[in-house]
Interface confidence: medium
Amino acid sequence: LTCLGGFASPGPVPPSTALRELIEELVNITQNQKAPLCNGSMVWSINLTAGMYCAALESLINVSGCSAIEKTQRMLSGFCPHKVSAGQFSSLHVRDTKIEVAQFVKDLLLHLKKLFREGQFN
């Protein structure tokens, strides 16, 4: 994570900065949500535990044609050590529960806020 590429400036970005920027983007999504996010698309719910960044990306990458979450998808890929492609699933998905993207983003934001407060940047 220490080599994560930043959006504001080139070069390495500290994990705390990367997490803060991800939180800021999720806040921005929730703030500017006028119509249903991604036309109300549904995604697999995930367990918000270790490895959740990859799991979150695996869920969101299956949403296509939604520009509102493209930046989030790019940011999450920086946190995930392996390449993620559509249709890929990890054990962290709650495979029997699908939720709207908007709710997924809110849940993820809530959890990331907690991690940031606790100083868990990795």
Partner: antibody, heavy 121, light 107 residues
């Protein structure tokens, strides 16, 4: 010492403009989101505007939208508020306040001392 | 927009009293709430963040609790320097909103 110092306040006529500055010291300014908050004489606190660390996200209160512009210069450790089309109801003490991450974390932990803006003919 | 209400709007108390203020949000703000103390002519000072965490350097007689829509600030034993106005702030979503404040004066 962590410090925020506002400047630029003063007396201005209705319809006029003013630019407020907030100089930060004692912390890594570029790592913090920033806000402007105001307080009319004898009244409560009102949030005015927010700017994220790298200028990516900016929000305004409805009462100032289209008239006020928030900006920052991380190289100069400075926050600004450009106020145009000023009205009598903009008369207030203006504070800058530090934020961890907008709308999420531990907002407004450090405040400046404030600068007074008076809009009157 | 999220509305914040505070009660009481003012109270008279004596040194040594236990005082409690309430702040209510018009919708769920999780724990995105801070409490601030302001004295005349001075900038606000943060006492509590994340609804219940004590700001560094703030005396432990101040405590916060609550989450969701209802929050409280308690001063366990009021001191002379505590006579001031207290505001709550929600920073869960924009526009950020402050409560109207509770003024504490000497009985």
């Amino acid at each position: 010492e962590v410090q925020l110092v506002e400047s630029g306040g003063g007396l201005v006529k209705p319809g006029g403009s003013l630019r407020l500055s907030c100089a930060a010291s004692g912390f890594t300014f570029s790592s913090y989101s920033m806000n402007w908050v105001r307080q009319a004489p004898g009244k409560g606190l009102e949030w005015v505007s927010y700017i994220s660390t790298s200028n990516s996200y900016i929000y305004y209160a409805d009462s100032v939208k289209g008239r006020f512009t928030i900006s920052r210069d991380n190289a100069k450790n400075s926050l600004y508020l450009q106020m145009n089309s000023l009205r009598a109801e903009d008369t207030a003490v203006y504070y800058c306040a530090r934020d961890q991450v907008g709308a999420t974390l531990d907002a407004f932990d450090i405040w400046g001392q404030g600068t007074m803006v008076t809009v009157s003919s | 927009d999220i509305q914040m209400t505070q009660s009481p709007s003012s109270l008279s108390a004596s040194v040594g009293d236990r005082v409690t203020f309430t702040c209510r949000a018009s919708q769920d703000i999780t724990d995105d709430l801070g409490w601030y103390q302001q004295k005349p002519g001075k900038a606000p000072k943060r006492l509590i963040y994340a609804a219940s965490s004590l700001q560094s350097g703030v005396p432990p007689r101040f405590s916060g609790s609550g989450s969701g829509t209802e929050f409280t600030l308690t001063i366990s034993s009021l001191q002379p320097e505590d006579f001031a106005t207290y505001y709550c702030l929600q920073h869960n979503s924009y526009p950020f909103t402050f409560g109207p404040g509770t003024k504490v004066d000497i009985r």
